[in-house]
Every structure is written in C-alpha cells, then in structure tokens.
C-alpha cells in the first residue's frame, strides 16, 4: 500500500541550463492522496531559503502526479541559482531537494554553450 504522505519529487542534484530572455517553467512534482497541500517556492541564499512571494505560479495536473510551477517570463540573469519547493501537510513542512538554474546571459555570451558544456563547465556561464 502506497504511503499517503505528501512527496515532492524534485530530482536530487538536478540542473537546468537556460537562456536569459527565454520563458521557462520550473516544475515541482507533487504527489498527494486527498487534499492538495499548500506549496511554495524559495530561492537559496547561503543556508537560508528566501520565499518567493510575488512570483507567478500555477498548478498542472497529470494522472498520477501534480506539478507546482514557478514561471519565469522571461528568465533574467539574476534568476541564476538554486531553488527549492516546500509543502505544508498536516502541520509538517516537507522540503524538496534543491534544483539549480544556470542562466546564460545571451548579451555577454559570444556563443551558446551546449547542454553538456554547461553541465560539466558551469564557469562558462560567467564569462
């Protein structure tokens, strides 16, 4: 029998390589049984995670899982960094793994690095 605890399925050590100026949706996969929990996004600043209060978010429902989406319209260079989603469920706070956005600023990048380059050589993003 599957657990009815809320689960947040952001992949551990996950990364997204994205371009400034593009739209982007950051998904937090949420598994729950009955009542949909209250979910929020925050951005890591050192050891603290700063809640993103005024950002556009939405829900997307699929057959066995739902997604709480943080919208970037468009992506800005200072969106670079690590994000986490968290859910309040039966007075418990459940936190996801963090996921990292590597933002390439197209104005400063002479050419667009490949996904593999960006994954293996993140310093390319800060040229």
């Amino acid at each position: 029998k599957e657990s009815c605890d809320v689960q947040l399925y952001i992949k551990r050590q996950s990364e997204h390589s994205i371009l400034a100026g593009d739209p982007f949706e950051l998904e937090c996969p949420v598994k729950y049984c009955a009542n949909r929990p209250h979910v929020t996004w925050c951005k890591l600043n050192g050891t603290t995670c700063v809640k993103l209060e005024d950002r556009q978010t939405s829900w997307k429902e699929e057959k066995n899982i739902s997604f709480f989406i943080l919208h970037f319209e468009p992506v800005l260079p200072n969106d670079n960094g690590s994000y986490r989603c968290s859910a309040n469920f039966q007075s418990n706070l459940i936190e996801s793994h963090s996921t990292t956005l590597y933002v390439t600023d197209v104005k400063s990048a002479s050419e667009r690095p490949s996904k593999d380059e960006m994954a293996s050589r993140p310093w390319l993003l800060y040229r």
């Epitope: 689960q7 399925y9 952001i10 992949k11 551990r12 050590q13 996950s14 990364e15 997204h16 390589s17 996969p29 066995n64 899982i65 793994h97 996904k115 593999d116 994954a119 293996s120």
Partner: antibody, heavy 119, light 112 residues
C-alpha cells in the same frame, strides 16, 4: 512494475563507436535519472554517468567525458549510451540503471549489454 | 574522486555463521541535505547487481532481514547475521553523495 530492457550484444573493432539503448517501462521516464554503469570481465562496477531525460542534462565521470555521450528520447522512453574511439579495455557489460523519482539511488537495473572490442 | 575501500576482498563463511564487510570512504559521505548516500549492492554469479541497502541502513523490499547496514561519515558496514547458500556473490558499496559516483572494489563471499 519497472522494467529496463537493453539492446543486444555488440562486437566492435578498435577505434569504432557503439550505441547502446535501454527502453524503460512501468514508471514515468521523465521523472527519474538514467545512469550507465559498466563491468569489465571479472572486474568491479564503474559508474559512467547519468542523464536527466526531462532536459537532457548530463553528468559524466571525467574518465569518460568526451568519449561517452548519453542521450534520452522521452517519446519512446529510451536512454542511449554512445561510446566512441573504442579500445580493448572497453570490453565490458554495460548496465542501464534507473532510480526512483530522481533520488540517484540506483534502484532498478537492466539486464546488461555485452560489448566486445576486438580486432 | 571519492575512493571507496572495501575489506576484506574475499571471505569464506560457513552457512549459519555471520559475515561482515567494511567500506571506508576517503571523505565523509554526509550530504548537505542531512542524508548519507551510501548503498550496498549484491551481484550473484551471472546476474545484474541488485540493491540491498540504501541510505546506509534502509533495507530494500524483498531483502531478507538477516542483512543490515550501519555506519556514518566515512565508515560503513554490511552485516549478514546468518549466511545462507543463496548469499554467494560479490558485494559492492557505492557512494552517491559526490560526483563522480564511485563503487568499492567488491567483496567476494563464498560458502565453506
């Protein structure tokens, strides 16, 4: 239940390339990582790397960086490993491995594909 | 890279007797999320590896409770309380805290 079905055995000459496939079923392919691990005859296990099928993001052991290429096709729920400039030391069984919702815990293993590199 | 060192590299055990395998990592495997990504795998002759234990001590479903895992930081142990004939094979520890992920060199378990 989770199933990972890998392509059949390959025999290649030194310097050639090989592309292995791993078809996943029984879970949402996009919500997990696909890893590749190899094992030379009579030797131990060696992690090659992993791919996030949702966005194509990859991580490789530096030993394989530049010679190994992992890709994933979410339409067919298939992960691929291409290894180029083959040498005899690449003779091994290559396993594809999936984990539960991207936990990176190597939960489910395929049956393996034997690649033999010989002139 | 994190080096995983297993001892012994082989052991021969009488059925019903206990067995213990040690795994030492070159660096603490405690991740920033508070979890320790240390697994144990069993590979029976001619088969794919299968996971026995994850996150140091959590037993996979279907794994007999004679298997147990313990440890923290850099020192980890796999114990079999009473070895059975079906336990023959090679046992590997593995770390998934740091890239690149690495395996121990393996410990071959034989029955006396």
């Amino acid at each position: 239940q989770v199933q990972l079905v890998q392509s059949g055995a390959e025999v290649k000459k030194p310097g050639a390339s090989v592309k292995l496939s791993c078809k996943a079923s029984g879970y949402n392919f996009k919500h997990t990582y696909a890893h590749w691990v190899r094992q030379a005859p009579g030797q131990g296990l060696e992690w090659i790397g992993r791919i996030d099928p949702a966005n194509g993001n990859t991580k490789y052991d530096p030993k394989f960086q530049g010679r190994a290429t992992m890709t994933a096709d979410t339409a067919s729920n298939t992960a691929y490993l291409e290894l180029s400039s083959l040498r005899s030391e690449d003779t091994a069984v290559y396993y594809c491995v999936a984990d539960h919702y991207g936990s990176s815990l190597l939960d489910y293993w395929g049956q393996g594909t034997l690649v033999t590199v010989s002139s | 890279d994190i080096v995983m060192t297993q001892t012994p590299l082989s052991l021969s055990v009488t059925p019903g007797q206990p067995a213990s395998i040690s795994c030492k990592s070159s660096q603490s495997l405690l991740d920033s999320d508070g979890k320790t990504y240390l697994n144990w795998f069993q590979q029976r002759p001619g088969q794919s590896p299968r996971r026995l234990i994850y996150l140091v001590s959590k037993l996979d479903s279907g794994v007999p409770d004679r298997f147990s895992g313990s440890g923290s930081g850099t020192d980890f142990t796999l114990k079999i309380s009473r070895v059975e004939a079906e336990d023959v094979g090679v046992y590997y520890c593995w770390q998934g805290t740091y890239f690149p992920y690495t395996f121990g060199q393996g410990t071959k378990l034989e029955i006396k």
